[in-house]
């Protein structure tokens, strides 16, 4: 039985050209997290964090995606095209799969100044 819950940063906004941290946290379960996958709105894979082999950044994103902090993901050099949904998928044993959703809105610099959480200065 799956007892865990995923907490995410929810809806966030960040400046064009800036960086933002996407964070998910799995709680209320003793299941072993074997892997966390990060996907973009079109279901393309951004990165994998495997418990045994570590981080793997999809080659197409290696210049704009940085691992961490923790199981989170840092997106850099944001463009307006980065606006959209992001998903964290926790693969666990024995529970199975948990999935969280974050919506990122990339704003022109002047609009975004006071609205981003988890944003890197």
């Amino acid at each position: 039985m799956m007892t865990g819950t995923i907490e995410t940063t929810g809806n966030i906004s960040a400046k064009k050209g800036g960086s933002v941290i996407l964070q998910c946290h799995l709680s209320s379960t003793m299941a072993q997290v074997t892997q966390v996958n990060w996907e973009q709105h079109d279901h393309s894979l951004l990165a994998i964090r495997n418990a045994e082999l570590g981080w793997h950044i999809y080659p197409a994103f290696k210049d704009r995606v940085a691992p961490g902090p923790g199981l989170g993901l840092t997106l850099q050099s944001l463009t307006m095209n980065d606006t959209g949904e992001y998903f964290c998928t926790y693969h666990t044993y024995p529970d199975g799969t948990y999935r969280g959703r974050i919506f990122l809105e990339v704003l022109e610099s002047s609009v975004a100044e006071h609205s981003a959480r988890f944003q890197i200065p």
């Epitope: 074997t34 892997q35 996907e39 393309s44 894979l45 045994e52 570590g54 793997h56 290696k62």
Partner: antibody
Framework: QVQLVQSGAEVKKPGASVKVSCKAS????????MHWVRQAPGQGLEWMGI????????SYARKFQGRVTMTRDTSTSTVYMELSSLRSEDTAVYYC??????????????WGQGTMVTVSS | EIVMTQSPATLSVSPGERATLSCRAS??????LAWYQQKPGQAPRLLIY???TRATGIPARFSGSGSGTEFTLTISSLQSEDFAVYYC??????????FGGGTKVEIK
């Protein structure tokens, strides 16, 4: 050219261990993951595990954890797969196969010729 | 683990005809899917990776498509050397990386 050459066929008794070698040539050994896949007679392909030859990190299928050990010798560009506590169901052809670069998992693009392991009393 | 299901288990096709093989993943693997060909007594050979990219030296009659959970391998005009067993495999979640059960393409 890129190739993987495996050790010869083995016949083992139940309870014994077997160690199969796989020597790589024609590419930079440390830069690519190595996988082990087995195939029982008349059956499909079964993934056993993976090793990062650069740093020795491994990840094993849960089914084999505690019985399988994958190691490497960078000086000879050779990986090894040892399976212990053998039983008749372990009778199979064992393949090593090169995966993607260690920055991304990738498909299995180069395969060894296979090593037949027969477990019989 | 991600379960890969191939269909049909056996496909009977005449030489020169088109063959369409299916592979379904129990959850999204994005485009991280490969197809392999295996002939009796031989090691598998990589045909397609990234769901649709042909591996080096693979003839153009082999093509892959799909994304997410549904994938297809098409052999446009079967040659005698194409009769073999074909496996799909996901390489996005591990352990374990998982293979489908295989589709045997036989001569009709």
């Amino acid at each position: 050219q890129v190739q993987l050459v495996q050790s010869g066929a083995e016949v083992k008794k139940p309870g014994a261990s077997v160690k199969v070698s796989c020597k790589a040539s024609g590419y930079t050994f440390r830069e690519y993951y190595m996988h082990w896949v087995r195939q029982a007679p008349g059956q499909g392909l079964e993934w056993m595990g993976i090793i990062n030859p650069s740093i020795g990190l491994t990840s094993y299928a849960r089914k084999f954890q505690g019985r399988v050990t994958m190691t490497r010798d960078t000086s000879t560009s050779t990986v090894y797969m040892e399976l212990s506590s053998l039983r008749s169901e372990d009778t199979a052809v064992y393949y090593c196969a090169r995966g993607g670069r260690t920055t991304w998992i990738g498909a299995l693009d180069i395969w060894g010729q296979g090593t037949m392991v027969t477990v019989s009393s | 683990e991600i379960v890969m299901t191939q269909s049909p288990a056996t496909l009977s096709v005449s030489p020169g005809e088109r063959a369409t093989l299916s592979c379904r993943a129990s959850q999204s693997v994005s485009s991280n899917l490969a197809w392999y060909q295996q002939k009796p007594g031989q090691a598998p050979r990589l045909l397609i990776y990234g769901a649709s990219t042909r591996a080096t030296g693979i003839p153009a009659r082999f093509s892959g498509s799909g994304s997410g959970t549904e994938f297809t391998l098409t052999i446009s005009s079967l040659q005698s050397e194409d009769f073999a067993v074909y496996y799909c495999q996901q390489y996005v979640v591990w352990p374990p990386l998982t293979f489908g059960g295989g589709t045997k393409v036989e001569i009709k």
